[in-house]
């Protein structure tokens, strides 16, 4: 029950996280005009990964897409790539995890297969979350660098009295959405990996049979394969061997966790 809950919760948390990553990637407010200690402007500038926008005091908002690919900063391209990779991995992870959910029955899919899929989706969610966090962090670092550079020469003189006010940009809402979403996806991925351990057959509790032959006590223990990783064939609920010759005193031996054939 706890495994199902952990898996289900991991799926939901990852779903919310990936939705957040998609939202952050699409948002225009990755960087917003810094209003603190600046002349009061009748416009508000903000920028996203795909376009920059200006909202005028009348409420009119105008956005211009970055219609160039080669002319964009390498860092921005890198952030775009990280976010897209995060979304793609997350989407695939979601697809895989749907089929891996314990509460969903698909044909005669064995638990080991579900465990494998749960682990795979968990890893995908973790990488997806890390990609989003990395992308947002790279962009934030870029902003901080540019902020202090523009603060250093806040007013650049142009021909004596004439001054140009440099627009400084600070963290936009999308950065916080991205960080939180990346974190949620990461947490969801970890939960899926934890759930995988519970889904995987730790060991198989089969009755073992002892054979007494010529004074030697040799125990033959079938089905003792340990599949704690979640890989390999699932034998947890299958009765492979129960029976065979028993000794006169009906001695039964059960495999311990140290027993291997």
């Amino acid at each position: 029950m706890a495994v199902t809950a952990c898996q289900g919760l991991g799926f939901v948390v990852s779903l919310i996280g990936i939705a957040g990553i998609i939202a952050a990637t699409c948002m225009d407010q990755w960087s917003t005009q810094d209003l603190y200690n600046n002349p009061v402007t009748a416009v508000f500038n903000y920028q996203g990964l795909w376009r920059s926008c200006v909202r005028e005091s009348s409420g009119f908002t105008e956005c211009r897409g970055y219609f160039t690919l080669l002319g964009l900063p390498a860092m921005l391209q890198a952030v775009r790539a990280l976010m897209i990779v995060g979304i793609v991995l997350g989407a695939i992870g979601l697809l895989v995890s749907i089929f891996a959910l314990k509460c969903i029955r698909i044909g005669s899919m064995e638990d080991s297969a579900k465990a494998n899929m749960t682990l795979t989706s968990g890893i995908m969610f973790i990488v997806s979350g890390l990609c989003a966090i990395a992308g947002v962090s790279v962009f934030a670092n870029m902003l901080v660098t540019n902020f202090w550079m523009s603060t250093a020469n806040m007013y650049t003189g142009m021909g004596g009295m004439v001054q140009t006010v440099q627009t400084r940009y600070t963290f936009g809402a999308a950065l916080f959405v991205g960080w939180v979403a990346g974190g949620l996806t990461l947490i969801g991925g970890v939960m899926m990996c934890i759930a995988c351990r519970g889904l995987a057959p730790e060991e198989t509790n089969y009755k073992a049979v002892s054979y007494h032959a010529s004074g030697h006590s040799v125990a033959y223990k079938p089905g003792g394969f340990k599949a704690s990783t979640g890989f390999g064939s699932n034998t947890k609920n299958k009765k492979i061997y129960d029976g065979g010759a028993r000794t006169e005193d009906e001695v039964q031996s059960y495999p311990s966790k140290h027993d291997y054939v």
């Epitope: 009061v40 920059s52 926008c53 140009t164």
Partner: antibody, heavy 120, light 113 residues
Framework: EVQLVESGGGLVQPGGSLRLSCAAS????????MHWVRQAPGKGLEWVAY????????YYVDKLKGRFTVSRDNAKNSLYLQMNSLRAEDTAVYYC?????????????WGQGTLVTVSS | DIVMTQSPDSLAVSLGERATINCKSS????????????LAWYQQKPGQPPKLLIY???TRESGVPDRFSGSGSGTDFTLTISSLQAEDVAVYYC?????????FGGGTKVEIK
């Protein structure tokens, strides 16, 4: 047709108060920011204040902050300018003007103005 | 505050001739976010309220005759009346539309020579 009609002007003594009104019609008043601009007799235009469509933010020219207060009532399609501690230099024609949409913050429609005379 | 300096103070031009008014701002009115200039030109005839002619430094307001044109960028702007008509006699003002307070130039009075 967009119409802006100012009222409330008149003769007032120095130190007195006056409340100007601007009645708007012909457009969705609640969707537009509004400005007050004044013009002293024979002088140029001087921007006074701006109030956004939702009453926040509000901006004033520094020298009038504290004495002048701009407000609006979207339900009544009305703009107001409360003027306190009036001085002789506040004598001017006061115009209300609409903050145009998609015209780079320009003032696209103006009222005919109301004259405020501050004199003893 | 942004200081808007208009020149000349007054201008006498013959009918049909070109009239040019200059406006200089103490800070650039070019917004980096959209690379647009936030400067407007107004016409005020005697006894009337101002009328918007040009916004964004160069875009004519609807209904404004095409003999009126605006140009310039950053700190230096120009209003040109290509062929002066009798009805163009007025005072012309430039206005900073980027920074609060939205300051106006001192005005240029255009008369017929």
């Amino acid at each position: 047709e967009v119409q802006l009609v100012e009222s409330g002007g008149g003769l007032v003594q120095p130190g007195g108060s006056l409340r100007l009104s601007c009645a708007a019609s012909g457009f969705t008043f609640s969707s537009f920011g509004m400005h007050w601009v004044r013009q002293a007799p024979g002088k140029g235009l001087e921007w006074v204040a701006y109030i956004s469509s939702g009453s926040s933010p509000i901006y004033y020219v520094d020298k009038l902050k504290g004495r002048f207060t701009v407000s609006r009532d979207n339900a009544k399609n009305s703009l107001y300018l409360q003027m306190n501690s009036l001085r002789a230099e506040d004598t001017a024609v006061y115009y209300c003007a609409r903050a145009g949409y998609a015209v780079r913050n320009a003032l696209d429609y103006w009222g005919q103005g109301t004259l405020v005379t501050v004199s003893s | 505050d942004i200081v808007m300096t208009q020149s000349p103070d007054s201008l006498a031009v013959s009918l049909g001739e070109r009239a040019t008014i200059n406006c200089k701002s103490s800070q650039s009115l070019l917004n980096v976010g959209n690379q647009k200039n936030y400067l407007a030109w107004y016409q005020q005839k005697p006894g009337q309220p101002p009328k918007l002619l040009i916004y964004g430094a160069s875009t004519r307001e609807s209904g404004v005759p095409d003999r009126f044109s605006g140009s310039g960028s950053g700190t230096d702007f120009t209003l040109t009346i290509s062929s002066l008509q009798a009805e163009d006699v007025a005072v012309y003002y430039c206005q900073n539309d980027l920074f609060y307070p939205l300051t106006f130039g001192g005005g240029t009075k255009v008369e017929i020579k």
